[in-house]
Interface confidence: low
């Protein structure tokens, strides 16, 4: 087996081609780095499964508003 | 158990083609993307220089777009990775590696995703 990589940076080369239900979604993180071939969105689902997903796509950023609004509104 | 045997590796003059081959057993394509990677003599290991999903998707790396093509053969379990206008510095070690996409197979995995290597097949380009 090849030396692990010691790159720290994570980059996306494809984009998911499905829409994610909101209610799989945990959490996301912007992929911004220069590094990276792609600007990209990458959801961690409840199953902790990382998607990498297109920021342009307007369900994307709906997803997005959604999990900032969860992260902001305290569950009682 | 998944496995990935390559093949196809030799000693080509720069300018030639060769043609790798990755034979997977243990788990079909269906829900997996296989990528290929390079390590040269002493150097951090490259890659994915290109990525084929069970989607159709592709991905090729700046450095092989162009000269490298991935396809598969979905009846036979292989990847292939034909390589033409092959340069001195292509000269690595060629791993092929595969993960599965999950349970939603939405979207191609992250370059650290992949879990199952095969044993390399070596790669030399004379000048």
């Known amino acids: 087996q090849p030396d692990a990589i010691n790159a720290p940076v994570t980059c996306c080369y494809n984009f998911t081609n499905r829409k994610i239900s909101v209610q799989r979604l945990a959490s996301y993180r912007r992929i911004t780095s220069s590094k990276c071939p792609k600007e990209a969105v990458i959801f961690k689902t409840i199953v902790a499964k990382e998607i990498c997903a297109d920021p342009k796509q307007k369900w994307v950023q709906d997803s997005m508003d959604h999990l900032d609004k969860q992260t902001q509104t305290p569950k009682t | 158990e998944v496995q990935l045997v390559e093949s196809g590796g030799g000693l080509v003059q720069a300018g030639g083609s060769l043609r790798l081959s990755c034979a997977a057993s243990?788990?079909?394509?269906?829900?997996?993307?296989i990528g290929w990677f390079r390590q040269a003599p002493g150097k951090e290991r490259e890659g994915p220089l290109c990525?084929?999903?069970?989607?159709?998707?592709?991905y090729y790396a700046d450095s092989v777009k162009g000269r490298f093509t991935i396809s598969s053969d979905n009846a036979k379990n292989t990847v292939y990775l034909q390589m033409n206008s092959l340069k001195p510095e292509d000269t690595a070690v060629y791993y092929c590696?595969?993960?599965?996409?999950?349970?939603?197979?939405?979207?191609?995995?992250?370059?650290?995703?992949?879990?199952?290597w095969g044993q390399g097949t070596q790669v030399t380009v004379s000048s």
């Open positions: 243990g788990f079909t394509f269906d829900d997996y993307a």
């Open positions: 590696a595969a993960e599965s996409l999950g349970d939603y197979g939405l979207a191609s995995p992250l370059p650290a995703d992949f879990g199952s």
């Open positions: 990525i084929s999903s069970s989607d159709g998707s592709t």
